[in-house]
């Protein structure tokens, strides 16, 4: 089932995506679709990235992350409630049925009255504590034991700190993957 | 040291092509790309294409797409920028450009262009 | 592709002065894979910064860079006589790359 992410129209949504990429060489091509993942590539594709860059993309889709580090993180901007739905992010692995696929839905509200400070509302809300590890090859995935409590003011600070990719990065360099939705 | 040492001048005729070398030096070759930049008398850079020298895969800017062709000798430690059907505007002097082949573990994912060549003046005249 | 627009086009300045160099991205820069580079008349041009804030090697620390997103600014914080010169800002995460079309910061 879909990770949920919420976000408030007008505000920027953010899908997390990340994979570590093999050290040295060539990106892995990732593609970012409007839909969950079908058995190949992406449906209805908003961005798309290569060895190198992203070689594709449709306004307001953008990349804010590291994304040469793995960092592939959509980022929708200015969302309305036609954005709602499901989001396919696509790590095209080389060989055959070697992708690793992530369906993650997003959930637009009304916005509010009363506007929330705005570092928080840029970044989209809910927070389930899970934290996988993967190692270099595709299949090597592992869930670690349960996280320590967190109290709301470390989820916003871990908000605005992933936010701004710093902890993401240091996280991906550990070899971790962070989800947060 | 490191640096890329760029082939020489070069004065051709329109409809003909060009070739132009860039040798690298002191660090592994293969390990970056590189790019092709060029800068057109008392006018901005513009950006042509890269080659993943480890590799050897190419992109292109769409501008010059069908007229550019970049290439590599990894044993020469040399890249090459050929462009073919010249005309009067591709008058310009011709950078090549290092960057890292990524990904890096530490530190941003990339370091843009860090070293460039001297240049080298393609001129197109009748 | 992306376009990059540099203001001011020409930035006269003295020594010891502060420079503010703008950079405005048509749409979102991916990464922030932001650079600038000074090029000299006859020379090629030189990385200052990488990653909309990172000093190259060797660059001395009075450049510095922040933004993101489509805003970048390049800041001298004291002027020296080398300093003068053309400064372009590229973008290097879409493709195909693209350079602003340059600020000429000269003597006043």
């Known amino acids: 089932s879909e990770v949920e992410y919420r976000a408030e129209v007008g505000q920027n949504a953010y899908l997390p995506c990340f994979y570590t990429p093999a050290a040295p060489g060539n990106l892995v091509p990732v593609c970012w679709g409007k839909g969950a993942c079908p058995v190949f590539e992406c449906g209805n594709v908003v961005l798309r990235t290569d060895e190198r860059d992203v070689n594709y993309w449709t306004s307001r889709y953008w990349l804010n992350g590291d994304f040469r580090k793995g960092d592939v993180s959509l980022t929708i901007e200015n969302v309305t409630l036609a954005d709602s739905g499901i989001y396919c992010c696509r790590i095209q692995i080389p060989g055959i049925m070697n992708d690793e696929k992530f369906n993650l839905k997003l959930v637009i509200k009304p916005a509010k009255v009363t506007p929330a400070p705005t570092r928080q509302r840029d970044f989209t809300a809910a927070f389930p504590r899970m934290l996988t590890t993967r190692g270099h090859g595709p299949a090597e995935t592992q869930t670690l034991g349960s996280l320590p409590d967190i109290n709301l003011t470390q989820i916003s600070t871990l908000a605005n700190e992933l936010r701004d990719s710093r902890l993401a990065n240091d996280l991906r360099d550990s070899g971790a993957t962070i989800r947060i939705g | 040291e490191v640096q890329l040492v760029q082939s020489g001048a070069e004065v051709k005729k329109p409809g003909a092509s060009v070739k132009v070398s860039c040798k690298a030096s002191?660090?592994?070759?293969?390990?970056?790309?590189m790019h092709w930049v060029r800068q057109a008398p008392g006018q901005g850079l513009e950006w042509m294409g890269w080659?993943?020298?480890?590799?050897?895969?190419?992109k292109y800017s769409q501008k010059f797409q069908g007229r550019v062709t970049i290439t590599r000798d990894t044993s020469a430690s040399t890249a090459y920028m050929e462009l073919s059907s010249l005309r009067s505007e591709d008058t310009a002097v011709y950078y090549c450009?290092?960057?890292?082949?990524?990904?890096?573990?530490?530190?941003?994912?990339?370091?843009?262009?860090?070293?460039w060549g001297q240049g080298t003046m393609v001129t197109v005249s009748s | 592709g992306i376009v990059l627009t540099q203001s001011p086009g020409t930035l006269s300045l003295s020594p010891g002065e502060r420079a503010t160099l703008s950079c405005r991205a048509s749409?979102?820069?991916?990464?922030?894979?932001l650079a600038w580079y000074q090029q000299k008349p006859g020379q090629a041009p030189r990385l200052l910064i990488c990653?909309?804030?990172s000093r190259a090697t060797g660059i001395p620390d009075r450049f510095s860079g922040s933004g993101s997103g489509t805003d970048f600014t390049l800041t001298i914080s004291r002027l020296e006589p080398e300093d003068f010169a053309v400064y372009y800002c590229?973008?290097?995460?879409?493709?195909?790359?693209?350079f602003g079309g340059g600020t000429k910061v000269e003597i006043k």
């Open positions: 450009a290092r960057d890292h082949v990524l990904p890096l573990y530490y530190g941003s994912g990339s370091y843009a262009f860090d070293i």
């Open positions: 002191g660090y592994t070759f293969t390990s970056y790309y």
């Open positions: 080659i993943n020298a480890g590799n050897g895969n190419t």
């Open positions: 749409q979102s820069v991916s990464g922030d894979y």
């Open positions: 990653g909309a804030s």
């Open positions: 590229q973008q290097y995460g879409s493709s195909p790359y693209t």
